[in-house]
C-alpha cells in the first residue's frame, strides 16, 4: 500500500501493507496496533487511500495511495 496515517490529532507513519507489525507512534504504545475495517460512516474518510479502524482507540486511520499523505491522504506529495 502506501503510508499509514492516523486521525488528525496524531502525526507520523504507523505501518504499511497488511502483514507488517504495526506499532504506535507514541511511547506508551508498546504492543502491536490492531485494525479492522472502518465502519460505513467513514466510507469517504480517506480521500486518496484506504480506511482502517484502530480497534483499541476506536478511531480511523488511513493507508495512503502512493503520491499522497496527510491524516486523510488529502495532500499531494509534490516530490513523488
Amino acid at each position: 500500500d502506501g503510508n499509514t496515517t492516523r486521525t488528525p490529532e496524531t502525526n507520523g507513519s504507523l505501518c504499511g501493507a497488511p502483514g507488517e507489525n504495526c506499532t504506535g507512534t507514541t511511547p506508551r504504545q508498546k504492543s502491536k496496533t490492531h485494525f479492522s475495517r472502518c465502519p460505513k460512516q467513514y466510507k469517504h474518510y480517506c480521500i486518496h487511500g484506504r480506511c482502517r479502524f484502530v480497534m483499541d482507540e476506536q478511531t480511523p486511520s488511513c493507508i495512503c495511495e502512493k503520491g499522497y499523505f496527510g491524516a486523510r491522504c488529502e495532500q499531494v506529495d509534490l516530490f513523488y
Epitope: 497488511p18 502483514g19 504495526c22 485494525f35 475495517r37 472502518c38 460505513k40 484506504r50
Partner: antibody, heavy 119, light 107 residues
Framework: QVQLLESGGGLVQPGGSLRLSCAAS????????MSWVRQAPGKGLEWVSG???????TYTDSVKGRFTISRDNSKNTLYLQMNSLRAEDTAVYYC?????????????WGQGTLVTVSS | SYELTQPLSVSVALGQTARITCSGD??????VHWYQQKPGQAPVLVIY???DRPSGIPERFSGSNSGNTATLTISRAQAGDEADYYC?????????FGGGTKLTVLG
Amino acid sequence: QVQLLESGGGLVQPGGSLRLSCAASGFTFSSYAMSWVRQAPGKGLEWVSGLGHVGYTTYTDSVKGRFTISRDNSKNTLYLQMNSLRAEDTAVYYCARDYLDFGYYFDVWGQGTLVTVSS
Amino acid sequence: SYELTQPLSVSVALGQTARITCSGDKIGKKYVHWYQQKPGQAPVLVIYDDSDRPSGIPERFSGSNSGNTATLTISRAQAGDEADYYCQAWDMQSVVFGGGTKLTVLG
C-alpha cells in the same frame, strides 16, 4: 490458485479435545485475517473465531475460554484448538479468508471438516 | 448482540425475479454481504459491500441496503440458483450471519 484445505475433524467424546488445521495456498497467507465458521447439521452458518494478520484474536461467546485460534505463517496454516467439547459443537468447520482486515467479508472458503461430539 | 433476520424460504418461478430480505436494526449503516450455499458445498460470496459483485458472479445477482432491510435480488432465476442464501454483517468486532433462506426455483 487460491485454496484453503481443512483437516483434523473427527469423532470425539464430550469433554474431549481436537485441533483443526487449515492449509492455505495461492496467496500471501500472512497478509490476511482468517476466520473459522461452523455449520451444525441442517442449520445455518455461525462465525466461531477470527485471527488478524498481526495476531489479534476474537471469539463468539459460546466458545470463549474453550477454543483457541492460532496461525503459523511459516507453514501457511491456521489452527483451531478445541477443548472441553460439547455436543452442540458438532458441525462442519470451515476456514475462511477475510478480505484484507477484520470487518470485511469472506472471499475464500475451504471445503470444511466435520467435527462430531458424541459419546 | 446484533441479529440479522431472514425468511426461512422463498419461492420463485423459473425466469422470474427472487428477492431475499435481511433485516436488522439500522442495517443500512452497516456493510452487508451475501453468500450462496448449495447442498454439500462451502458457501460462495455472491454480493459484498451491499451491492458489489465478485468476478464470476452473474449480473443477475444484485443487492441493496437501506434503513432496516438489505435485499438480495436474483433476476431471471435459473434452476442452478436453487440454494441457501445467507446475509452477513460485522458488528462490535464480531461477525454476524443471518439464519439463511432456502430459495426454491419452481418449474
